[in-house]
Amino acid sequence: QGQDRHMIRMRQLIDIVDQLKNYVNDLVPEFLPAPEDVETNCEWSAFSCFQKAQLKSANTGNNERIINVSIKKLKRKPPSTNAGRRQKHRLTCPSCDSYEKKPPKEFLERFKSLLQKMIHQHLSSRTHGSEDS
């Protein structure tokens, strides 16, 4: 049940990431650590790296408020789960600083990709033989 709540939150975050992608030109063009091809059992660690990243509005134009609200939603801590706690204790997961740094557009694309991977794993785990290739 807790894991379900977590994944439902991940699904909602995908929409927020997609919204932010529409305002990518209004974000500070700073390079941010962007995990990619995250190894199994390090997904939650990578997720926290995305949440910690200093994604910022460039404070230009009319979009500043909606951007700041979306960034705040992205950074909202999800409820703790056993899976998350287990992974926190994995000392083998790369540190946030070790991940390649990317500009906001690629950062958001990689964040979305991780969220999709986590949801897909969750969905697949409920179904025997669902993964065909």
Partner: antibody, heavy 117, light 107 residues
């Protein structure tokens, strides 16, 4: 705004292979999940399967032995192949995007495929 | 497979009416439910995902509720463009499955 357009023959003979292509515009196929759903005349929607931009697939077990979904990122297209078709495969076939993995946020308008000799 | 049962199969209503459509899953699906609107010859449109989250660009007169096995789509004040067929879809496990549809017709 992402747009999807199905294309392929509207008539397929029994025992042959149904082949459809979905062309994606207004967005890149190199992220998200891309799926096929069908609707036989007078019936409800049936999920056929989907493919991730990286090529991993999930298929409906009821069709799994006959279905192949593939993606061509260079052409921004993905395709469906359904082998050994019968009259029961007559349906409107829709292609769709799944950004959220669990639901389909953009769909094509659908194409009717009739299986008949 | 998880069976999705929608009721009613059709409903006649007038502009301004409040319309409620229900969807029942054959087993618990948490909040893994989406709702779609489909008009003949048009592309289906996602309205609601994870039971109650409104898809971007969808009018606020549409709302979804429920969890477990029983779910509801509500149109608070029916508009002329809302006459269509509505489908629910579960995503708790593969294969993804749809309800049989509810046709909203003009009274």
């Amino acid at each position: 705004q992402v747009q999807l357009q199905e294309s392929g023959p509207g008539l397929v003979k029994p025992s042959e292979t149904l082949s459809l292509t979905c062309t994606v515009s207004g967005g890149s196929i190199s992220s998200d999940f891309w799926g096929w759903i069908r609707q036989p005349p007078g019936k409800g929607l049936e999920w056929i399967g989907y493919i991730s931009s990286r090529g991993s697939t999930n298929y409906n077990p009821s069709l799994k032995s006959r279905v192949t979904i593939s993606v061509d990122t260079s052409r921004n297209q993905f395709s469906l192949k359904l082998s050994s078709v019968t009259a029961a495969d007559t349906a409107v076939y829709y292609c769709a995007r799944s950004a959220g993995v669990t639901d389909f946020d953009f769909w094509g308008q659908g194409t009717l495929v009739t299986v008949s000799s | 497979d998880i069976q999705m049962t929608q009721s009613p199969s059709s409903v006649s209503a007038s502009v301004g009416d409040r319309v409620t459509i229900t969807c029942r899953a054959s087993q618990g699906i948490s909040s893994w439910l989406a709702w779609y609107q489909h008009k003949p010859g048009k592309a289906p449109k996602l309205l609601i995902y994870v039971a109650s989250s409104l898809q971007s660009g969808v009018p606020s007169r549409f709302s979804g509720s429920g969890s477990g096995t029983d779910f509801t789509l509500t149109i608070s004040s029916l508009q002329p463009e809302d006459f269509a067929t509505y489908y629910c879809q579960q995503a708790n496990s593969f294969p993804l499955t749809f309800g049989g549809g509810t046709k909203v017709e003009i009274k």
